[in-house]
């Protein structure tokens, strides 16, 4: 059961219910576990994990990344700006997570779990955010054409894209977790 659902808390009546921050923290760690499981399948299936050609393909993908200006690093840390960046970044990752859905054979359910858990995480974070006006939602039409473009790539590029999405999403979540623990 994903940590976004309450069954574990119900099963342990003597335990203090998780705070909002603890639930977010737990949710991110759950998603990272899922990403790691998906990485195993991609690395076993192709040699992408050892590839040095990452940079070539990375130029064609506009994956969300933390930068100094986002206020998530300790130097220049800004809670509100950072929270907006985390939510915006996760919303931008959603189209890439959708792309991953038919990319796995034995880990199909895991890919779905990562996608659904990310949606839950976004909901948790939106409740925490005060300045929801600053959060820009990606344009559905743009996302649809991006998805079509990604799915039209040759096999090698699709494998590389899958690898890069998982690696970038992992690093984005790690940065987010570090920042959220400062809040």
């Amino acid at each position: 059961v994903p940590p976004g659902e309450d069954s574990k808390d119900v099963a342990a009546p003597h335990r203090q219910p998780l705070t909002s921050s603890e639930r977010i923290d737990k949710q991110i760690r759950y998603i990272l576990d899922g990403i790691s499981a998906l990485r195993k399948e991609t690395c076993n299936k192709s040699n992408m994990c050892e590839s040095s050609k990452e940079a070539l393909a990375e130029n064609n993908l506009n994956l969300p990344k933390m930068a100094e200006k986002d206020g998530c690093f300790q130097s220049g840390f800004n809670e509100e700006t950072c929270l907006v960046k985390i939510i915006t970044g996760l919303l931008e990752f959603e189209v890439y997570l959708e792309y991953l859905q038919n990319r796995f054979e034995s880990s199909e359910e895991q890919a779905r779990a990562v996608q659904m858990s990310t949606k839950v995480l976004i909901q948790f974070l939106q409740k925490k955010a005060k300045n929801l006006d600053a959060i820009t939602t990606p344009d559905p039409t743009t996302n649809a054409s991006l998805l079509t473009k990604l799915q039209a790539q040759n096999q090698w590029l699709q494998d590389m894209t899958t690898h890069l999405i998982l690696r970038s999403f992992k690093e984005f979540l790690q940065s987010s977790l570090r920042a959220l623990r400062q809040m």
Epitope: I28, R29, C49, F73, Q74, S75, R167, Q174, S175, R181
Partner: antibody, heavy 127, light 111 residues
Amino acid sequence: EVQLQESGPGLVKPSQTLSLTCTVSGGSIATSYYAWSWIRQPPGKGLEWMGVIDYDGDTYYKPSLKSRTSISRDTSKNQFSLQLSSVTPEDTAVYYCARAGLGDSYYLGTYYAMDYWGKGTLVTVSS
Amino acid sequence: QAGLTQPPSVSGSPGKTVTISCAGTTSDVGTGNFVSWYQQLPGMAPKLLIYDVNKRASGIADRFSGSKSGNTASLTISGLQSEDEADYYCASYRSLNNVVFGGGTHLTVLG
């Protein structure tokens, strides 16, 4: 008990590539959320972190060494390796391999705590 | 980018307490609880003493303790013993999956 052992040539010529391997026993490098690091120490000087390969096989390098450094792993042999290209006499050092990953390191990407170390191997760069 | 700043040497008498400082910036020591301390005896590999600022590694005596204030971390060794004479290094996570060490401090146990 986890044990690490560095191996490789003790003498490398300037401009060549230094290659070292760390063999891990007492635990699999593919298990759990540990990461595997390389650290070096020039004679009479302090420790310098060079880079790490994490549980997923992702690598991170010290920015000033990034262009010359490559870390890889072979899970079937339970080994991970370091390659440092275009070496100069300044790269002469004792090279250590170590395990990192205590606490929430994997989830946070913070591999600064290394709990098991190899004994180290001295590599001299000289013609 | 420079490493963390440690005093080159400290000394103390047996049974006394010494503290070694490790000064960094908001990009490393100041970020979260990401500080570790190592002891290196002559001719040996470093040994982890403290991680996450103040957690003792497995098998480490409670004479060793760690703390942090702002951008400076500290290692305190109480009940000083002759076998504590060694080099001590701090390390910290630095932005973007990078690790940085201090320059090292040599501890001399007097007498």
